[in-house]
Interface confidence: low
């Protein structure tokens, strides 16, 4: 069964910069991948951005660098000014489109305990949902 | 250059529903983001919401959240604005705009605009 | 939701005078804001973007200054094609526009 998981970073020298990283553990080819915050896209949530593998990028302020890491991972970097800046607890969803498995959708958010700059390995998210 | 070109004129009763259209010619239309505002008579300009045609997905202002749909048919390189629930105070110009960035910066703007809709809501 | 609060909401100059409109972000944007200039009937026109860039084919005698939550637009010599109405937008999330100002011929 495909996996999506999230890891979530606050940098070290920006308090208000945060690093989101995705990916997708499946055998199928990603055809897009959609990140939000405050909850999954069409759910509440806010895109943050859009990476499609052809196509190319496209981010929503307050996200400054998206990018592909691997075939299967993303990240994207948060800049936040005032009114943008994520809260500790802030939620950032991962949507995975991919043929032949479909939508694949996982949360995460920085955790309790974190220091800027440090986090724990990224695990697979529950999977929210799959289309 | 990118051209938008906007649906014609509506006028709509109250209650009822309106679907306005914005076709983008000579540039790319999938990669950018399509945004609407409004501007009601002798009034500012408000941002409804936008979308992003290469995944179809749409963020909206608080305001007008359940009530505005934003979809996009990158086939025809055409952005739709449909908002429910009419009523008199929806009377205003409707605008479709790209919404332009420049590289990996997070500095975004309107450029260009459609030459906009108007509608009407009147019993 | 982040507002932005334009002054004055109108005013009258001359041919030649040189105008300051200012726009206030309700928190602190950056430098994520656009002004735009709107005639009557005919669709808004990017002038300036991230606060200060010149939008291609705007004549210099516009600029745009300032970061946080206080901007300013001003045209060092008013044209005759510069009576108009004027939004400031802000991009820091999402986005907002100013509620106007009309610059009208005295």
């Known amino acids: 069964t495909p996996e999506v998981w999230v890891q979530v970073r606050m940098e070290a020298t920006e308090l208000s910069s945060f690093t989101i990283r995705c990916g997708f553990l499946g055998s199928g080819s990603i055809s897009l991948v959609t990140v939000s915050w405050g909850g999954p896209n069409g759910a509440g949530g806010t895109t943050l951005a859009v990476l499609h593998p052809e196509r190319g990028i496209r981010q929503w302020a307050p996200a400054r660098q998206a990018r592909w890491e691997t075939q299967s991972s993303i990240s994207l970097i948060l800049e936040g000014s005032g009114a943008s800046s994520p809260c500790a607890n802030t939620t950032f969803c991962c949507k995975f489109a991919s043929f032949p498995e479909g939508s694949w959708e996982a949360c995460g958010s920085l955790p309790p305990s974190s220091d800027p700059g440090l986090s724990a390995p990224p695990t697979p998210a529950p999977i929210l949902r799959a289309d | 250059q990118v051209q938008l070109v906007q649906s014609g004129a509506e006028v709509k009763k109250p209650g009822s529903s309106v679907k306005v259209s914005c076709k983008a010619s000579g540039g790319t239309f999938s990669s950018y983001a399509i945004s609407w505002v409004r501007q009601a008579p002798g009034q500012g300009l408000e941002w409804m919401g936008g979308?992003?045609?290469?995944?179809?997905?749409?963020n909206y202002a608080q305001k007008f959240q359940g009530r505005v749909t934003i979809t996009a048919d990158e086939s025809t390189s055409t952005a739709y604005m449909e908002l429910s629930s009419l009523r008199s105070e929806d009377t205003a110009v409707y605008y479709c705009a790209r919404d332009t960035g420049r590289g990996y910066t997070r500095h975004f703007w309107f450029d260009p605009w459609g030459q906009g809709t108007l509608v009407t809501v009147s019993s | 939701d982040i507002q932005m609060t334009q002054s004055p909401s109108s005013l009258s100059a001359s041919v030649g005078d040189r105008v300051t409109i200012t726009c206030r972000a309700s928190?602190?944007?950056?430098?994520?804001l656009n002004w735009y200039q709107q005639k009557p009937g005919k669709a808004p026109k990017l002038l300036i973007y991230?606060?200060?860039s010149l939008q291609s084919g705007v004549p210099s005698r516009f600029s745009g200054s300032g970061s946080g939550t206080d901007f300013t637009l001003t045209i060092s010599s008013l044209q005759p094609e510069d009576f108009a109405t004027y939004y400031c937008q802000q991009s820091d999330i999402l986005y907002t526009f100013g509620g106007g100002t009309k610059v009208e011929i005295k």
């Open positions: 991230a606060a200060s």
């Open positions: 979308i992003i045609p290469i995944s179809g997905t749409a």
């Open positions: 928190q602190s944007i950056s430098s994520y």
